[in-house]
């Protein structure tokens, strides 16, 4: 299973600030695809 989360269990101010500046759902989706590719599946299943 693979779950993509829009929020975080940890205090990540950089993540929060980026999320707040995303202007569209497309930006939101692209950013999280980038995150998933770079973090190695930390909290997703």
């Amino acid at each position: 299973k693979h779950k993509c989360f829009r929020n975080s269990l940890e205090n990540n101010e950089t993540l929060e600030s980026i999320m707040n500046t995303l202007e569209s759902e497309e930006d939101f989706r692209k950013y999280f695809y980038y995150l998933e590719g770079s973090k190695g599946g930390g909290g997703s299943k």
Partner: antibody, heavy 128, light 107 residues
Framework: EVQLVQSGGGLVQPGRSLRLSCAAS????????MHWVRQAPGKGLEWVSG????????GYADSVKGRFTSSRDNAKNSLYLQMNSLRAEDTALYYC?????????????????????WGQGTTVTVSS | DIQMTQSPSFLSASVGDRVTITCWAS??????LAWYQQKPGKAPKLLIY???TLQSGVPSRFSGSGSGTEFTLTISSLQPEDFATYYC?????????FGQGTKVEIK
């Protein structure tokens, strides 16, 4: 029946340690994030910690960061909260809770922090 | 952190009354809000999530609405088993935060 059964509370002196346990049954434990939430006597609810399905992400409230450690053993369907350097202000009823892992069809993403199943609570009293 | 504020803190009502509880967020949280009910000596129970979605098994007299910074929980016809404390909680971002609670008492 989906159930969370807690154990491990008690009376402890300031500065000492205590470990809380939460045994899960009735659902696939390793599919979900889990949380600890506390409630001081006569007060409201305060989130303490959250841990992802595989322990890859663990978060803490600022009030307990560096003193409390959340962990889980998926093979045993169990969640733990190790509490060190306890203070009087940690006195509370502690609940473990399962995360719903809500899926938002509009965005295509999941969200943490909706707690849909709760344990019965265990009391921690920190006093000399 | 996002601050959640509930109004009123205490509410006296009679069986059959329509009851409304309001919750405000210190910043916009879209519809990422949940409501819980807690009875004395018991664990909280999830009532509503995503501002307006009723949790399975919760009676239809409970409803939620709102988005952004203002939300409401409505009980259309108060029943004896509804006398309890109600909490709102944002799940928009870390850390999740709860309102201070609204205690619904028998008039």
């Amino acid at each position: 029946e989906v159930q969370l059964v807690q154990s491990g509370g008690g009376l402890v002196q300031p500065g000492r340690s205590l470990r809380l346990s939460c045994a899960a049954s009735g659902f696939t434990f390793d599919d979900y994030a889990m949380h600890w939430v506390r409630q001081a006597p006569g007060k409201g609810l305060e989130w303490v910690s959250g841990i992802s399905w595989n322990s890859g992400s663990i978060g803490y409230a600022d009030s307990v960061k560096g003193r409390f450690t959340s962990s889980r053993d998926n093979a045993k369907n169990s969640l733990y909260l190790q509490m060190n350097s306890l203070r009087a202000e940690d006195t509370a009823l502690y609940y473990c809770a399962k995360d719903m892992e809500y899926y938002d069809i509009l965005t295509g993403y999941y969200s943490y922090y909706i707690m849909d199943v709760w344990g019965q609570g265990t009391t921690v009293t920190v006093s000399s | 952190d996002i601050q959640m504020t509930q109004s009123p803190s205490f509410l006296s009502a009679s069986v059959g009354d329509r009851v409304t509880i309001t919750c405000w967020a210190s910043q916009g949280i879209s519809s990422y809000l949940a409501w819980y009910q807690q009875k004395p000596g018991k664990a909280p129970k999830l009532l509503i999530y995503a501002a307006s979605t009723l949790q399975s098994g919760v009676p239809s007299r409970f409803s939620g609405s709102g988005s952004g910074t203002e939300f409401t929980l409505t009980i259309s016809s108060l029943q004896p088993e509804d006398f309890a404390t109600y909490y709102c909680q944002q799940f928009n971002s870390y850390p999740p935060t709860f309102g201070q609670g609204t205690k619904v008492e028998i008039k």
